[in-house]
Interface confidence: low
């Protein structure tokens, strides 16, 4: 894509000119002392407050003043005498300046001579102070004369710049950093024969000026428009320019504010929150129990979520963050909270065995329940003969030795787990004592 002077649809934005170095065709004895307003070293780029506002600093258009190589404006003085002595044309046009205009169709340049009168050029090569059909990167010699000055004429060497379409202003901003940074870079998209050492690049963004081919602006506000004007100079002559208005990407959303999160039942929990201030698309709610993590995508309009099918008496750590899908997905900081679900009845003990250890003694064992669902651990054994409860024991482990039972009697053994809040379903086995062997 070729550089455009201003983006479409921003007709109200004035494009300021950059301050330009003196357009000198011949080296001057003195150094070029032109300086630029603003200091890039310590200037901070601030958009104006308000949504998507373009900084005022970017919109201060200024008049372009063409300067001589010494940096001072060219003022012609004439001493009035009876027979005025004419200067030489070489002297009169010593500090002549030139602008280059490019024709994209013919791919040729026109050099515009910045003089007040219509000068003549040797070989009739200029019309209305313009030298036409100049090929990029080629030198052309023009002999300038006028009836107000005498020989010798001014010999002007036109050092023609490269073609404008060989350069493209490229947005080099990394998408990951596009919320707070802008990168702009001039790319050479075709080769040319001009000496690249003679090409200088200039950017002006607000009050910040850079003499670089690539600029990077950092610490910017997300979701704001910033305007940068740029130009390329060849031997200190501007030959192309471009402006870009770049809107920084959406920033990371802020952290949601959790109002409360709690569990009021064994299998349920609830979390409520206030959304973050900045733009976002959706929420991600993650809940972690021990080593398991589950995450849900939640609609941006939600401010409450009921968690179902939770495990009883389990600590859940919840994290809630907002995210926005911009040039990349940006996640906001996560707000964290936790709760422990209420107790519930434990599951049944399993692998229960009843074995006879002597004529009137039994050994009852079982395995712990798969889900304890509560704070404590206690095993209970009830032994019934007929409808009569003959034993009721409680141990830390499921290992009971039941002695002094009646011989030749049918017994029902019920083992269950109690978690401190709830008992579990009993495991029931029937077993009979034998006749005494003696």
């Amino acid at each position: 894509q070729s550089p455009t002077p201003s983006p479409t649809g921003v007709s109200s934005v004035q494009t300021p000119h950059l301050p330009t170095h003196a357009d000198s065709q011949t080296p001057s004895a003195g150094t070029d002392t032109q300086t630029f307003s603003g200091s890039a070293a310590n200037a901070k780029l601030n958009p104006t407050p308000g949504s998507n506002a373009i900084s005022d600093a970017y919109l201060n258009a200024s008049e372009t003043t063409t300067l001589s190589p010494s940096g001072s404006a060219v003022i012609s003085t004439t001493t009035i005498a009876t027979t005025p002595s004419k200067p030489t044309c070489d002297e009169k046009y010593a500090n002549i300046t030139v602008d280059y205009l490019y024709n994209k169709e013919t791919k040729l340049f026109t050099a515009k001579l910045n003089v007040n009168e219509n000068v003549e050029c040797g070989n009739n090569t200029c019309t209305n102070n313009e030298v036409h059909n100049l090929t990029e990167c080629k030198n052309a010699s023009v002999s300038i004369s006028h009836n107000s000055c005498t020989a010798p004429d001014k010999t002007l060497i036109l050092d023609v710049p490269p073609g404008v379409e060989k350069f493209q202003l490229h947005d080099c901003t990394q998408v990951e950093k596009a919320d707070t940074t802008i990168c702009l870079k001039w790319k050479n998209i075709e080769t040319f024969t001009c000496d690249t050492q003679n090409i200088t690049y200039r950017f002006q963004c607000g009050n910040m000026i850079f003499d670089n081919k690539e600029i990077k602006l950092e610490n910017l506000e997300p979701e704001h428009e910033y305007k940068c004007d740029s130009e390329i100079l060849y031997n200190n002559h501007k030959f192309t320019n471009a402006s870009k208005i770049i809107k920084t990407d959406f920033g990371s959303p802020g952290e949601p504010q959790i109002i409360f999160c709690r569990s009021e039942a064994a299998h349920q929990g609830v979390i409520t929150w206030n959304p973050p201030q900045r733009s976002f698309h959706n929420f991600t709610l993650c809940y972690i129990k021990e080593t398991e993590k589950d995450c849900l995508n939640l609609d941006k309009n939600l401010i409450k979520y009921d968690l179902q099918n939770l495990k009883p008496y389990t600590k859940y750590v919840l994290s809630l963050h907002a995210y926005i899908i911009a040039k990349v997905q940006r996640n906001g900081s996560a707000a964290m909270c936790h709760f422990t679900t209420k107790s519930a009845p434990p599951s049944q003990v399993w692998n229960m065995t009843v074995s006879m250890t002597s004529d009137n003694s039994m050994h009852v064992k079982c395995r712990p329940p798969r889900d304890r669902n509560g704070p404590h651990e206690r095993y209970h054994l009830e032994v019934e003969a007929g409808n009569t409860l003959v034993r009721n024991e409680s141990h830390k482990n499921c290992d009971f030795r039941v002695k002094d039972l009646q011989y030749s009697t049918d017994y029902t053994f019920k083992a269950y787990f109690h978690n401190g809040d709830y008992p579990g379903e009993p495991f029931i086995l029937h077993h009979s004592t034998s006749y005494n062997s003696k």
């Epitope: 972690i288 021990e290 080593t291 398991e292 993590k293 750590v317």
Partner: antibody, heavy 119, light 107 residues
Framework: QVQLVESGGDLVKPGGSLRLSCAAS????????LSWIRQAPGKGLEWVSY????????KYADSVKGRFTISRDNAKKTLHLQMNSLRAEDTAVYYC????????????WGQGTLVTVSS | EVVMTQSPATLSVSPGERATLSCRAS??????LAWYQQRPGQAPRLLIY???TRVTGIPARFSGSGSGTEFTLTISSLQSEDFAVYYC?????????FGGGTKVEIK
Amino acid sequence: QVQLVESGGDLVKPGGSLRLSCAASGFSFSGYYLSWIRQAPGKGLEWVSYISLSGSFIKYADSVKGRFTISRDNAKKTLHLQMNSLRAEDTAVYYCARRTGTTTVFDYWGQGTLVTVSS
Amino acid sequence: EVVMTQSPATLSVSPGERATLSCRASQSVNSNLAWYQQRPGQAPRLLIYGASTRVTGIPARFSGSGSGTEFTLTISSLQSEDFAVYYCQQYNNWPLTFGGGTKVEIK
């Protein structure tokens, strides 16, 4: 309380292999990034490797890259360091350490296990 | 990698006196710097992170300051249990790197 217990340190010949383990307890193991950090006898600390919650993000010091492999078993609450092609300069006490929740600094460390590489 | 340089290597201080330990980074690490204490035969213990944020439970006599490349750990009034080796660690860049340590010994 939070505990990290390293094991597997031993005397091994140059070129040999060793697998270190770090058993964790007292915290939600799967919710923390972990690291191995070593300390040669009488010397300072040197970071070795780092692993994310699920093991999808792993980093190694250049000195061990291609020879050491970090892994974790969240179900068993264990961190491992497989060390191959061992060199004399790998001799050190190896600590496993837990990263704080938000910053790449280490709030809990094990007591370390000594690895000696010598012929 | 970011090279962390601690000075002095050894600091001799009397109990009750102030100790100032320095840590310098070879390039800016912003405020991403931590300090650890290691007593003989023990694992390191985190004291400070973010250059100046004290870890919960660490006494107020320990304070950190600095940003960029120059950092300081100050122990305002040395107690007997403070005589140990202190390490700084940067976490601004991979690989994570530690300083060589400063041994604080009894004068």
